[in-house]
Interface confidence: medium
């Protein structure tokens, strides 16, 4: 799979398509996340290009939901959150690629795939077991290192890309720096390129037109295409539904991801929902902003994402007039604003930015079959294959 950003649903969809539907990925173990049972009225979000895409996750190339899948070991790790309170992150993380859900997922959905095989989530329903992902250092570690960390809860299945999954040759690990600036334009690939995104669907039709073993059409035949990429801009999974205003399917039945922004942002993927432990989740990786990490100068704002050492995180309200803002917030025009809000593209490559209690700003990076973004701000691209190897 090209090392493109998995920031768009379309892209994610493509990735998903790259591998045969529900073809387990190497080391792809999905916990608890199974594709919806085939036959369920899953609103497969078909990308305008005809690809199916799940909601936000798909939109975000399903990679946003994951805290770094790389750090599945984070489970239980406590990190400071925007609220200043230490919070234990879910221990299970799912591999971002798994989040794509095409690969390995427990057969949560009997209809979708063989019972023995990973559930056959819709292409967008990729769930990847966190266990499969290599364990990485605890959240604190990656926070300090600025490395990515797996979602404590485990990668969430990306919203299923409804596009058919095509087998995707495992690509070599591509550690490409897609850091392209806060604008999120550096996502490497157009969001539209995500599977399910209008632009991508057309540009990246199902690989070889393959469809999952179970017919996605059968599962989603009555679903209108859902262009998750439309709802997944460079921001977090929940933040937006469309990445590049691709309007191929303006009236999509599916809803795009929502965003969490503002000081009180949930960081739930504003763009990307957090991964639940052990559950399949959209492919994405979370990257917490390292303590005291600064974003750089922003007119009218002092970006100190974390409270000074020894200073407990203050409530937004209490810090509004203070000199410092809670972790994940920066002073802007005299008030504390969440990094996610001030920098919609704080997380690159379609990563979803959100604030987590006691952790601060997190970037949930997009993940797709065989490829996902990593890094504190999803600035790097790595392939699933690489990780698996």
């Amino acid at each position: 799979v090209p090392a493109r950003e998995a920031g768009s649903a379309v892209e994610a969809e493509e990735l998903v398509k790259g591998r045969p539907a529900w073809e387990p990925r190497a080391n792809d173990t999905r916990e608890e996340a199974g594709p919806p049972a085939a036959g369920e009225d899953e609103a497969s979000w078909t990308a305008p290009g005809g690809e199916l895409a799940g909601p936000e996750e798909v939109l975000q190339a399903t990679g946003t939901a994951w805290l770094e899948a790389d750090n599945p070991g984070l489970g239980g790790v406590t990190s400071e959150a925007g609220s200043g309170d230490a919070q234990a992150l879910p221990a299970t993380l799912q591999a971002p690629h798994e989040v794509l859900g095409q690969s390995v997922m427990p057969p949560a959905i009997p209809e979708a795939t063989e019972a023995s095989g990973p559930p056959s989530p819709t292409p967008g329903d990729n769930l990847s077991p966190a266990s499969e992902l290599p364990k990485e250092s605890p959240l604190e570690v990656w926070l300090n290192l600025g490395g990515s960390t797996p979602d404590p809860q485990g990668p969430e299945p990306t919203y299923p890309f409804q596009g058919t999954l095509e087998p995707q040759p495992a690509s070599d690990i591509i550690d490409i720096d897609y850091f392209q600036g806060l604008d999120g334009e550096g996502r490497g690939a157009d969001l539209g390129s995500f599977p399910g995104s209008p632009g991508t669907s057309e540009n990246h039709p199902d690989t070889e037109g393959e469809t999952p073993s179970w017919s996605l059409l059968d599962l989603y035949d009555d679903f209108t295409p859902f262009d998750e990429s439309d709802f997944y801009p460079t921001t977090s999974f929940y933040d937006d539904l469309d990445e590049e205003e691709e309007e191929e399917e303006d009236d999509k039945d599916a809803v795009g991801g929502g965003d969490l922004e503002d000081e009180n942002e949930l960081l739930v993927p504003t763009g990307k929902p957090g991964l639940g432990p052990g559950t399949g989740q959209p492919n994405s990786r979370w990257h917490a902003v390292p303590p005291q990490h600064t974003l750089g100068s922003v007119p009218g704002s002092s970006i100190a994402l974390r409270p000074r050492p020894g200073e407990p995180g203050r409530d937004l309200a209490s810090s509004e007039n203070g000199t410092e803002c809670r972790s994940g917030f920066v002073r802007h025009n005299g008030s504390c604003r969440s990094v996610c809000d001030l920098f919609p593209s704080y997380c690159h490559n379609g990563g979803q930015c959100y604030l987590v209690e006691n952790i601060g700003a997190f970037c949930r990076c997009n993940t797709q079959d065989y490829i996902w973004h990593k890094g504190m701000r999803c600035e790097s691209i790595i392939t699933d294959f690489q990780v698996m190897c």
Partner: antibody, heavy 116, light 111 residues
Framework: EVQLLESGGGLVQPGGSLRLSCAAS????????MSWVRQAPGKGLEWVSA????????YYADSVKGRFTISRDNSKNTLYLQMNSLRAEDTAVYYC?????????WGQGTLVTVSS | QSALTQPASVSGSPGQSITISCTGT?????????VSWYQQYAGKAPKLIIF???KRPSGVSNRFSGSKSGDTASLTISGLQAEDEADYHC???????????FGGGTKLTVL
């Protein structure tokens, strides 16, 4: 501070139309998907529709598809929901919410009553 | 789409812990870790208190915690307080026509 303020609700007869508006402030409106979620009296929440930040993508619940149209004017930081062919079952408090799946901010809601 | 299943009501005494369940299926709750919980006071708008199964938004009391097991997600409120009396709604991402699925809501009464 993120604020969402809905307006436009009211009493309308079955088959009638209403246009709800949601004025947003406190965040970069165009960067976020927005949704409409409703709650019938004494009932749970029901997602109605969502629109991407750019307005290029829209999504609807089957129950309103073809009758409701969600739109937004990013220059005015305003979200809209045009409701046509209203039915009694559309009676509910309509909330404007930020994002599409994870609603971190909600408006106070506007009541829409469809009755003859 | 049928809503997620929540008990209509739950009650507890101050200081106690209560758990509200939210049961779905493999296509929503069990399939994704995108479960969120909203608190809603009578006549007020919902407020996000838990997302991604167990994450708490900034500013939300740590007395609120979320978890998930199989098809069921749970919201636990420890050290119950009078101000916790409200309706609680769960929601989950769903890979279906309805990407956002809500539960029917649970009324929590603090005795």
């Amino acid at each position: 501070e993120v604020q969402l303020l809905e307006s436009g609700g009211g009493l309308v007869q079955p088959g009638g139309s209403l246009r709800l508006s949601c004025a947003a402030s406190g965040f970069t409106f165009s960067s976020y998907a927005m949704s409409w979620v409703r709650q019938a009296p004494g009932k749970g929440l029901e997602w109605v529709s969502a629109i991407s930040g750019s307005g290029g993508s829209t999504y609807y619940a089957d129950s309103v598809k073809g009758r409701f149209t969600i739109s937004r004017d990013n220059s005015k930081n305003t979200l809209y929901l045009q409701m046509n062919s209203l039915r009694a079952e559309d009676t509910a408090v309509y909330y404007c919410a930020k994002k599409w799946n994870l609603f971190d901010y909600w408006g106070q809601g506007t009541l829409v009553t469809v009755s003859s | 789409q049928s809503a997620l299943t929540q008990p209509a009501s739950v009650s507890g005494s101050p200081g106690q812990s209560i758990t509200i369940s939210c049961t779905g299926t493999s296509t929503d709750v069990n399939g994704y870790n995108y479960v969120s919980w909203y608190q809603q006071y009578a006549g007020k708008a919902p407020k996000l208190i838990i997302f991604d199964v167990s994450k708490r938004p900034s500013g939300v009391s740590n007395r609120f915690s979320g978890s998930k097991s199989g098809d069921t997600a749970s919201l636990t409120i420890s050290g119950l307080q009078a101000e916790d009396e409200a309706d609680y709604h769960c929601s989950s991402y769903r890979r279906l026509r309805l990407p956002v699925l809500f539960g029917g809501g649970t009324k929590l009464t603090v005795l």
